[in-house]
């Protein structure tokens, strides 16, 4: 099985009440603008076939995609939460920059690609949906990486 290295975040990253609240507020605000309730991006399907030890690496991929292709392109929306949450998530991404998997990660990339394809297919409403699931991203990062 692939071995993951440096795929850890200190639990203190997830114990800051202010930024946790802002992340959840941003997700709530965006989910109010999300009219596509049939589709879920971060759920059981995302983790299908991925072992517990590989989940932080998977969530790193999801986090980087969310930052680069969702949050930065929508960075002038959802005041005043966006401008606080994005730098926080960017710091987490930076801390996971050395998180790698030694060996085959094709099964992980396949799952992440499905999420990316769903967001792309939905266009701007897919981006809004991804922002609306930042609470799930936050919780999944916490569960997988601490």
């Amino acid at each position: 099985a692939p071995i993951s290295s440096h795929c850890r975040l200190d639990k203190s990253n997830f114990q800051q009440p202010y930024i946790t609240n802002r992340t959840f507020m941003l997700a709530k605000e965006a989910s109010l603008a999300d009219n596509n309730t049939d589709v879920r991006l971060i759920g059981e399907k995302l983790f299908h076939g991925v072992s517990m030890s590989e989940r932080c690496y998977l969530m790193k991929q999801v986090l980087n995609f969310t930052l680069e292709e969702v949050l930065f392109p929508q960075s002038d929306r959802f005041q005043p939460y966006m401008q606080e949450v994005v730098p926080f998530l960017a710091r987490l991404s930076n801390r996971l920059s050395t998180c790698h998997i030694e060996g085959d990660d094709l099964h992980i990339q396949r799952n992440v690609q499905k999420l990316k394809d769903t967001v792309k297919k939905l266009g701007e409403s897919g981006e809004i949906k991804a922002i609306g699931e930042l609470d799930l991203l936050f919780m999944s990062l916490r569960n997988a990486c601490i």
Partner: antibody, heavy 118, light 111 residues
Framework: QVQLHESGPGLVKPSETLSVTCSLS??????????WAWIRQPPEKGLEYIGR???????SYNPSLKSRAAISVDTAKNQFSLTLSAVTAADTSFYYC??????????WGQGTLVIVSS | QPVLTQSPSASASLGASIKLTCTLS???????IAWHQQQSGKGPRFLMR???????NKGDGIPDRFSGSSSGAERYLTISSLQSEDEADYYC?????????FGTGTKVTVL
């Protein structure tokens, strides 16, 4: 030091399409954390937002101009452009390009005056 | 979408201080804003960003005489030790609903 420089036609006839381009130097338009915007200002009047784009193509417009405005990006040339169709004298303005950093405009071009007249 | 209200004009003597106000509309009192200066015949220049806690991030090369603060829905720009080159129009800007808005601007005259 990032610099923005607008270039435009100077004069456009009514009902025609106005095109202005913004060239970026000292930085990359492919900076993932920035958005690139167009703002205009009729002579002796206030500022009006037109729209913005991310280098990946995500774009949004001022609702009042959405039907006539189109913003595009050319990463190879490190440029972004605005076209405004069916112009009238009311579109006579200084057109400014700008950089957005987490919503705030933090860099402006020097502006280019476009006059709509026959 | 938010609306920004600015008074049309303000004046103060050379060397004095002046405080400009930008008021956010109801429901948007926790929004960040940016302040921009436009000297006569020139393009706008970014001065600073001000959040609802009053902290501000200034643009490159902006003198220490310029500072930002906040109270409720009001965002302030204070220019201390006013210089002749500070005579200009000052605009506030905000965003957040998929579009951006500007205040109508305050014309500052140095007496």
């Amino acid at each position: 030091q990032v610099q923005l420089h607008e270039s435009g036609p100077g004069l456009v006839k009514p009902s025609e399409t106005l095109s202005v381009t913004c060239s970026l130097s000292g930085g990359s338009i492919s900076s993932s954390s920035h958005l690139w915007a167009w703002i205009r200002q009729p002579p002796e009047k206030g500022l009006e937002y037109i729209g913005r784009i991310h280098y990946r193509g995500s774009v949004s417009y001022n609702p009042s101009l959405k039907s006539r405005a189109a913003i595009s990006v050319d990463t190879a040339k490190n440029q972004f452009s605005l076209t405004l169709s069916a112009v009238t004298a009311a579109d006579t303005s200084f057109y400014y390009c700008a950089r957005l950093d987490m919503g705030a405009i933090d860099k402006w071009g020097q502006g280019t005056l476009v006059i709509v007249s026959s | 979408q938010p609306v920004l209200t600015q008074s049309p004009s303000a004046s103060a003597s050379l060397g004095a201080s002046i405080k400009l106000t930008c008021t956010l509309s109801s429901g948007h009192s926790n929004y960040d804003i940016a302040w921009h200066q436009q000297q006569s015949g020139k393009g706008p220049r970014f001065l600073m960003r001000v959040n609802n806690g009053g902290s501000h991030n200034k643009g490159d090369g902006i003198p220490d005489r310029f500072s930002g603060s906040s109270s409720g829905a009001e965002r302030y720009l204070t220019i201390s030790s006013l210089q002749s080159e500070d005579e200009a129009d000052y605009y506030c800007q905000t965003w957040g609903t998929g579009t951006h808005v500007f205040g109508t601007g305050t014309k500052v005259t140095v007496l």
